[in-house]
Interface confidence: low
């Protein structure tokens, strides 16, 4: 099943990323370089959607370096099949699952003054099934709550507060949310979770609700890059991937990210006993996207440079803020009762050879169904 | 390569002021602490206190707030320790040293300086 | 603060003994650092986060031990091993060093 997984990634968007740009890893190491003592936490699928979304009404030099930001390479695809392709995986995330709570969303706030193309707006609507708004940014206050009681409704109360503060001089807003919340195939027992020791760094102690349970899960150890590997399946298609590099290793694993080796440690994973122990957190990253990307290449569309003619007649408007928020939350509930003890025996030797592995200091995570729908660093929980 | 490089020795006066510095190499100040350790001859190792440059708060051993001073230059990207009001039992060797992120705090140490109070 | 007590506070050891050093804390603290130190030289970290050996130091150190109680154990002593050892706590400030154990060799 884990095999099965690999042969179907895309790594951040549906179609083959060429050499040249590894979108999601690239994204990650300017997030990191920005700030290597917090934590980080992004969707890579969801961000390549709305940037493809936001090709749809660009031109020229404008869609080309968006299309080449995403690393994506039109030689071997259409247009209309990247933008088919993202259709159907909006469709296929947005279904409703058991145990499976995802709101995924995009929205396009625009001043009052700008009229959109019509052609746009429906691509848009069909496709990304994304809402636009006229909005009054003269008045920054409601324009705020606006776009923030939109997201919040989305989200049903999930995500608040996506602005912190509004430009009054801004023309296009372009907000990008996802919220995950699943049910692990077999749950953490309440009863094993207690407040232990995370080194935030290894003079900062904070105490975290520790959740523990031994099993058999997909494991491995990477001599490499100095780290350990752990696959966590969510019920339905998703696992999540939790990365404990090696103490003092931390900046070569995330060198390390890349498509290659997300893929290696997919094919790689073997099953293993371990007494797992796994804090328990909400984690949530909030990004200025248009601060990030121009380090990636895609730089136009937020200047007076920006091509958007498809998006509306007016000739000057770009892009004044692109802001995207993921928040999950990862607690010790399943699908499936864990054993009372919190231990699963098989036979005796497989319990002898358990290993312990213990999240106590930062450690990175993937969420991954057939794309990656997160990538973090918990540097704190 | 990680290196810390401490000023030399010095040879100070009762009731005098010293600042001692520790100029870092093969890293940016910025984004680790910066530790001072005091060991008197023949004792053990104490610890003073460190900087996080990146948070702006400095920590001391309540023993030596007040008495101690640490301060940093992130353009010259050196530590400083200021020992005033000197008197024979602050006659030791004082060591700066890294922590913070990624590797093990305290993996590198600078090579110490010797301090001497004498009349 | 927290005091940590090492003992023996001074001790001999034959080549190829087996030597064990303690660290016991005046509360509980969540790992336990050791250093050693050689006349003349500044301190080296020897063993983190209770039982990590530092790069370049040989697999016949080990550290364990958890709560209130740590210890450092050499499994067959060496020549080369004559030195000071101190334990440090990192679990709350201000951080903390045993006094120290001066071992020998015989």
């Known amino acids: 099943e884990m095999k099965k997984r690999v042969e179907d990634l895309h790594v951040g968007a549906t179609v083959a990323p060429s050499s040249r740009r590894d979108f999601t890893f690239d994204l990650y190491r300017a997030l990191a370089s920005a700030a290597p003592s917090q934590s980080i936490f992004f969707s890579p699928v969801s961000i390549s959607m709305s940037l493809a979304m936001l090709s749809l009404g660009a031109g020229s030099s404008t869609k080309m370096q968006i299309l080449e930001g995403l690393g994506l390479n039109l030689q071997k695809s259409s247009e209309k099949e990247l933008h088919r392709g993202f259709q159907q995986l909006l469709q296929e995330l947005n279904q409703p699952r058991d145990g499976f709570q995802l709101s995924l969303g995009n929205a396009l706030f625009t001043d009052l003054v700008v009229d959109l193309q019509d052609t746009f707006v429906s691509a848009m609507k069909t496709l990304y099934l994304a809402d636009t708004f006229p909005t009054n940014f003269r008045d920054s206050a409601g324009a705020m709550k606006q776009i923030n009681d939109y997201v919040a409704k989305q989200t049903k109360g999930k995500i608040v507060d996506l602005l912190k503060n509004l430009d009054s001089n801004a023309v296009v807003i372009m907000v990008n949310y996802i919220f995950f919340k699943a049910k692990w195939e077999t749950s953490f027992n309440h009863k094993g979770t207690q407040e232990q020791d995370f080194y935030v760094t290894s003079e900062t102690v904070v105490r975290v609700p520790m959740m523990s349970r031994e099993d058999q899960y997909h494991y491995l150890l990477d001599r490499n890059l100095s780290c350990r590997v752990v696959g966590v399946p969510y019920q339905g298609n998703a696992t999540a991937l939790f990365i404990l590099p090696s103490e003092g290793k931390m900046q070569q694993v995330e060198n390390g990210l890349s498509e290659k080796t997300l893929r290696k440690w997919l094919k790689m994973f073997k099953k293993r006993q371990l007494e797992l122990y796994l804090p328990k957190f909400s984690i949530e990253g909030s990004y200025q996207l248009e601060k990030v990307l121009p380090s990636l290449g895609i730089s136009n569309v937020f200047t007076s440079h920006a091509d958007l003619s498809g998006i509306s007649n007016h000739s000057n408007i770009q892009v004044s803020e692109m802001v995207h928020k993921a928040v999950v939350e990862v607690d010790e509930s399943g699908t499936r009762a864990a054993a009372a003890t919190g231990t699963i025996f098989t036979f005796r030797s497989a319990r002898l050879n358990s290993q312990r592995l213990v999240f106590n200091r930062p450690f990175l995570m993937f969420i991954v169904d057939n794309n990656i729908l997160f990538l973090g660093k918990v540097n704190r929980p | 390569e990680v290196q810390l490089q401490q000023s030399g020795a010095e040879l100070v006066r009762p009731g005098a002021l010293v600042k001692l510095s520790c100029k870092a190499s093969?890293?940016?100040?910025?984004?680790?602490?910066i530790h001072w350790v005091k060991q008197r001859p023949e004792q053990g190792l104490e610890w003073i206190g460190r900087i996080d440059l990146e948070k702006g708060n400095i920590i001391y051993d309540p023993k030596f707030q007040g008495k101690d001073n640490i301060t940093a230059d992130t353009s010259s990207n050196t530590a400083y320790l200021q020992l005033s009001s000197l008197t024979s039992e602050d006659t030791a060797v004082y060591y700066c040293?890294?922590?913070?992120?990624?590797?093990?705090?305290?993996?590198?140490w600078g090579q110490g300086t010797l301090v001497t109070v004498s009349a | 603060q927290i005091v940590l007590t090492q003992s023996p506070a001074i001790m001999s050891a034959s080549p190829g003994e087996k030597v064990t050093i303690t660290c016991s804390a005046s509360?509980?603290?969540?790992?336990m650092h050791w250093f050693q130190q050689k006349p003349g030289t500044s301190p080296k970290l020897w063993i983190y986060s209770t039982s990590n050996l530092a790069s370049g130091v040989p697999a016949r150190f080990s550290g364990s031990g958890s709560g209130t109680s740590y210890s450092l154990t050499i499994s067959r002593m060496e020549a080369e091993d004559a030195a000071t050892y101190y334990c440090?706590?990192?679990?709350?400030?201000?951080?903390?060093f045993g006094s120290g154990t001066k071992l020998e060799i015989k």
């Open positions: 440090q706590q990192r679990s709350s400030y201000p951080f903390t």
């Open positions: 040293a890294r922590g913070g992120y990624d590797v093990p705090s305290f993996a590198y």
């Open positions: 509360s509980s603290v969540s790992y």
């Open positions: 093969g890293f940016n100040i910025k984004d680790y602490y």
